[in-house]
């Protein structure tokens, strides 16, 4: 047993059937020794009397707000949550797995450059009696501080019978260096409690590895005469580390039917103009990756032909 | 801003196509590196992140873009100790920085290179003659070094009398691909930015 | 909209069966715990046996245990309580309820979905 905060307590459990659960001793917090009663959640069942009280723990049923009572006052309170672990593994009951880009992904993370500014996200089913807690660190031994919000709903989207919750959190490196080579992986810690359940999940990885680019901003064409050729311009987006002559994007600009199934033309380019064909009811679209290292795509920026 | 379209320095040019040259011989060697080793920890998760230039150069402080010198945390650990001449920039532009930086970049190549050669010279003993280092990689180190023009003391080869612990050394080559490849990185931006400057 | 409804309820003489259905509708119950409440004349509702998400665990109220059997049809989202010996101390309406996240609870508090209930009366 350990205390997550003040008066709340994580029990761990070995969960199968029949297991022989934990035996927890509860004290409560006052100088008071006698006339002491225990109840458990809203339940006015006296459990036992005296100071402390033993308890065997092996369900959630055993797990809630135990509060401590004398004379009709309340004494103090403990909470106890419950974490799972089956066949030597802790569960996974709350959080999704993304499957993206490997089984057992529950934390999915994005940075838009190289500030140390970051955003992570998860899936959940579970509407209500939910609290998500982020903590997040350069390296684990010796950590390095990174400041992350509060948790917040960011999304609800339906799956066939049921709802999916998005959360989010931005994180940001509390002294980063957009230039420095990264030998630390930055770690982020999420502790979830639905309802009696404990459970925490992390993820560690390099800022260079999470990269996505906002799309190329300004997206333009310019018809060039007597052809039916035309000249793309765009624009780094305003996100994206500065300076650009430093931190540069390569292009990739595609010119795609109104058809899924039309043959796509795609350009990759260095610079922020390109010359391609335009087809009736076509759209080129431009997205943008950092030059030298190839992490993820940024969306497609779009305009139409006509 | 767009990316400058000036004509670039024709005495810059070389080493920024050097530079590419480099970040897609180290990519391809460490994408060979990472598909021949697969049963091996090769992987950025599974490795252990090590710099041999640590404390030994300072490229990253060196060859800071100005735009970023605001940033302090950039700035913490900024040392000048190279002071030299590279014939990559035209004289009239080489400042104090820019030596500096190109001094340090050098050096960072040389001491690779050291490793490199060392470390080829155990895989070819390997009986398994399962990974060797691509010689394009090697060529291309060489180039780059050669454009830079330093003129530094030849390091001695590391030889080395015991039998070589190949497992070892492939756990070695791995982590030694991964940090020069994120310092080819940080070469091409360098050489990208100098170019534009 | 998420809908429970309980069936099977009934008047029966002491020492009989009776065997209550639960239907869930409006949303996927295959992730969620089920249980079953009942609630006598003039007392508080309290706990008669529940079932976790997958079918494997089982939790039974002291003074059921051995004579009810909670069961599941994830396929169908059916929910059923075998009531076996019924005695008249059983006599309540039976209300079924969900709990999202896998793991049953004993606390009618942490349920997220419930029933209307179904009278079930036991005479002697």
């Known amino acids: 047993i350990w205390e997550l905060k003040k008066d709340v307590y994580v029990v761990e459990l070995d969960w199968y059937p029949d297991a022989p659960g934990e035996m927890v001793v509860l004290t409560c917090d006052t100088p008071e020794e006698d006339g002491i009663t225990w109840t458990l959640d809203q339940s006015s069942e006296v459990l036992g009397s005296g100071k402390t009280l033993t308890i065997q723990v092996k369900e959630f049923g055993d797990a809630g707000q135990y509060t401590c009572h004398k004379g009709g006052e309340v004494l103090s309170h403990s909470l106890l949550l419950l974490h799972k672990k089956e066949d030597g593994i802790w569960s996974t009951d709350i959080l999704k797995d993304q499957k993206e880009p490997k089984n057992k992904t529950f934390l999915r993370c994005e940075a838009k450059n190289y500030s140390g500014r970051f955003t992570c996200w998860w899936l959940t089913t579970i509407s209500t009696d939910l609290t998500f807690s982020v903590k997040s660190s350069r390296g684990s031994s010796d950590p390095q501080g990174v400041t992350c919000g509060a948790a917040t709903l960011s999304a609800e989207r339906v799956r066939g019978d049921n709802k999916e919750y998005e959360y989010s959190v931005e994180c940001q490196e509390d002294s980063a260096c957009p230039a420095a080579e990264e030998s630390l992986p930055i770690e982020v810690m999420v502790d979830a409690v639905h309802k009696l359940k404990y459970e925490n999940y992390t993820s560690s990885f390099f800022i260079r590895d999470i990269i996505k680019p906002d799309p190329p901003k300004n997206l333009q064409l310019k018809p060039l005469k007597n052809s039916r050729q035309v000249e793309v311009s765009w624009e780094y987006p305003d996100t994206w580390s500065t300076p650009h002559s430093y931190f540069s994007l390569t292009f990739c600009v595609q010119v795609q039917g109104k058809s899924k199934r039309e043959k796509k033309d795609r350009v990759f380019t260095d610079k922020t103009s390109a010359t391609v064909i335009c087809r009736k009811n076509a759209s080129i679209s431009v997205r943008a990756q950092d030059r030298y290292y190839s992490s993820s795509w940024s969306e497609w920026a779009s305009v139409p032909c006509s | 801003r767009n990316l400058p379209v000036a004509t670039p320095d024709p005495g810059m040019f070389p080493c920024l196509h050097h530079s590419q040259n480099l970040l897609r011989a180290v990519s391809n060697m460490l994408q060979k590196a990472r598909q021949t080793l697969e049963f091996y920890p090769c992987t950025s998760e599974e490795i252990d992140h090590e710099d041999i230039t640590k404390d030994k150069t300072s490229t990253v402080e060196a060859c800071l873009p100005l735009e970023l010198t605001k940033n302090e945390s950039c700035l913490n650990s900024r040392e000048t100790s190279f002071i030299t001449n590279g014939s990559c920039l035209a004289s009239r532009k080489t400042s104090f920085m820019m030596a500096l930086c190109l001094s340090s970049i050098y050096e960072d190549l040389k001491m690779y290179q050291v490793e490199f050669k060392t470390m080829n010279a155990k895989l070819l003993m390997d009986p398994k003659r399962q990974i060797f280092l691509d010689q394009n990689m090697l060529a291309v180190i060489d180039e780059l070094m050669q454009a830079l023009n330093f003129n530094s003391e030849t390091v001695p080869q590391k030889s080395s009398l015991e039998e070589p612990d190949f497992y070892k050394t492939k756990i070695k080559l791995c982590i030694l691909l991964h940090a020069f490849r994120i310092r080819a990185v940080t070469i091409d931006r360098v050489m990208s930015y100098l170019n534009a400057s | 909209e998420v809908q429970l409804v309980e069936s099977g309820g009934g008047l029966v003489q002491a020492g009989d069966s009776l065997r209550l259905s639960c239907a869930a509708s409006?949303?996927?119950?295959?992730?969620?715990?089920m249980g079953w409440f009942r609630q006598a004349p003039g007392k508080e509702r309290s706990f008669v046996a529940a079932?976790?998400?997958?079918?494997?665990?089982?939790g039974y109220a002291g003074s059921v245990k051995g004579r009810f059997t909670i069961s599941r049809d994830g396929v169908e989202n059916m929910v059923f309580l075998q009531m076996n010996s019924l005695v008249p101390e059983d006599t309540g309406v039976y209300y079924c309820?969900?709990?999202?996240?896998?793991?049953?609870?004993?606390?009618?508090?942490?349920?997220?979905?419930w029933g209307q209930g179904t009278q079930v009366t036991v005479s002697s």
């Open positions: 309820a969900a709990v999202e996240g896998r793991d049953y609870y004993r606390g009618a508090q942490y349920y997220d979905y």
């Open positions: 079932i976790n998400w997958s079918g494997e665990l089982t």
């Open positions: 409006g949303r996927s119950f295959s992730n969620d715990a």
